[in-house]
């Protein structure tokens, strides 16, 4: 996911709605003009603001990367919601890309957790119940099972 914090607003195009600030703040979906006199609407699909604010610029919409699906589009008041495609996941320590989930557990282990957009399948030892470290096993060692469906 890529996002820049501030999207400098170009000169207000005719279609950009203007209204007056209320107690110095502009409503969600707007930002304040430099002179503080007007509220200028964010551009749908390009930028947004989430709260009553005195921001000089709206925030730039996130664009989903390839390998991600867009669950909810960017509106003037909400950012995009992106999620890894089915069968892939994004780890906390490598948030920059979606990685393929393993298709099965090593021999002697059982699957106790499905592939989700945030985690690989979870495997535990049959006897001890201890978790597997997470390294993908060699193909001939796997007990295959279909990856879980990402939560929508």
């Amino acid at each position: 996911i890529t996002q820049q914090d501030l999207a400098p607003q170009q000169r207000a195009a005719p279609q950009q709605k203007r209204s007056s600030p209320s107690e110095g703040l502009c409503p969600p979906g707007h930002h304040i003009s430099e002179d503080g006199r007007d509220c200028i609407s964010c551009k749908y699909g390009q930028d947004y603001s989430t709260h009553w604010n005195d921001l000089l610029f709206c925030l730039r919409c996130t664009r989903c990367d390839s390998g991600e699906v867009e669950l909810s589009p960017c509106t003037t008041t909400r950012n995009t919601v992106c999620q890894c495609e089915e069968g892939t996941f994004r780890e906390e320590d490598s948030p920059e890309m979606c990685r393929k989930c393993r298709t099965g557990c090593p021999r002697g282990m059982v699957k106790v957790g499905d592939c989700t957009p945030w985690s690989d399948i979870e495997c535990v030892h049959k006897e001890s119940g201890t978790k597997h470290s997470g390294e993908a096993p060699a193909v001939e060692e796997t007990v295959t099972s279909s990856p879980g469906t990402p939560a929508s």
């Epitope: 914090d5 501030l6 110095g24 703040l25 969600p28 947004y48 989430t50 709260h51 009553w52 604010n53 005195d54 925030l59 996130t62 669950l71 909810s72 509106t75 008041t77 909400r78 950012n79 995009t80 919601v81 939560a151 929508s152």
Partner: antibody, heavy 120, light 107 residues
Framework: QVQLQESGPGLVKPSQTLSLTCTVS??????????WSWIRQHPGKGLEWIGY???????YYNPSLKSRVTISVDTSKNQFSLKLSSVTAADTAVYYC????????????WGQGILVTVSS | DIQMTQSPSSLSASVGDRVTITCRAS??????LGWFQQKPGKVTKRLIY???SLQRGVPSRFSGSGSGTEFTLTISSLQPEDFATYYC?????????FGQGTKVEIK
């Protein structure tokens, strides 16, 4: 991992001002896009949003409490604070601080909460 | 203000049960709704945002659905750690408002 911790007196006398502070760790209060809120929960009841502040100091309050509420921020200490004036027994509640996620989808991190009792 | 009507206010269920909690809004919210779990002595946890998106780290047995005025939180197979109180939050318009809560108890 962002963590929020409320602090302040657990007992306040009627007509006085309730003062609480929320200390943020694991992230900067000045990180763009995040708004910082106070929420309260009356004993055995539901949750009520009080208001929020942005790191720049701009605030927005629940109209039902607006006349009595002040929220302020101290970016150097990574803290934001709540003041509620002219308290009565009806202000007895657990007070929570929380962070609004920067994408506009509500609160993503909450504090543990602090019980404040208004009694003489 | 937008009123959020949550039902039921409490329910008793067993481990393994499928549990459904509903929130109705007094006006349309698009998908500007979240679900939260509250346990005594624990930090309140967001489960679902944008009506149906699962928060990172939340088990996939939790799911959310709905848009407009009617929303549902479903726990597909209740686990011992799921006994808690659940709240919905509308953040479509200020002031943001919560449902009254649903306490999920052990049968």
């Amino acid at each position: 991992q962002v963590q929020l911790q409320e602090s302040g007196p657990g007992l306040v006398k009627p007509s006085q001002t309730l003062s609480l502070t929320c200390t943020v760790s694991g992230g900067s209060i000045s990180s763009g896009g995040h708004y910082w809120s106070w929420i309260r929960q009356h004993p055995g009841k539901g949750l009520e949003w009080i208001g929020y502040i942005y790191y720049s100091g701009s605030t927005y309050y629940n109209p039902s409490l607006k006349s009595r509420v002040t929220i302020s921020v101290d970016t150097s200490k990574n803290q934001f604070s709540l003041k509620l004036s002219s308290v009565t027994a009806a202000d007895t509640a657990v007070y929570y601080c929380a962070r609004d996620d920067s994408s506009g989808w509500g609160f993503d991190y909450w504090g543990q909460g602090i019980l404040v009792t208004v009694s003489s | 203000d937008i009123q959020m009507t949550q039902s039921p206010s409490s329910l008793s269920a067993s481990v393994g049960d499928r549990v459904t909690i509903t929130c109705r809004a007094s006006q349309g919210l698009r998908n500007d709704l979240g679900w939260f779990q509250q346990k005594p002595g624990k930090v309140t946890k967001r489960l679902i945002y944008a009506a149906s998106s699962l928060q990172r780290g939340v088990p996939s047995r939790f799911s959310g659905s709905g848009s407009g005025t009617e929303f549902t939180l479903t726990i597909s197979s209740l686990q011992p750690e799921d006994f808690a109180t659940y709240y919905c939050l509308q953040h479509y318009s200020f002031p943001w408002t919560f449902g009254q809560g649903t306490k999920v108890e052990i049968k």
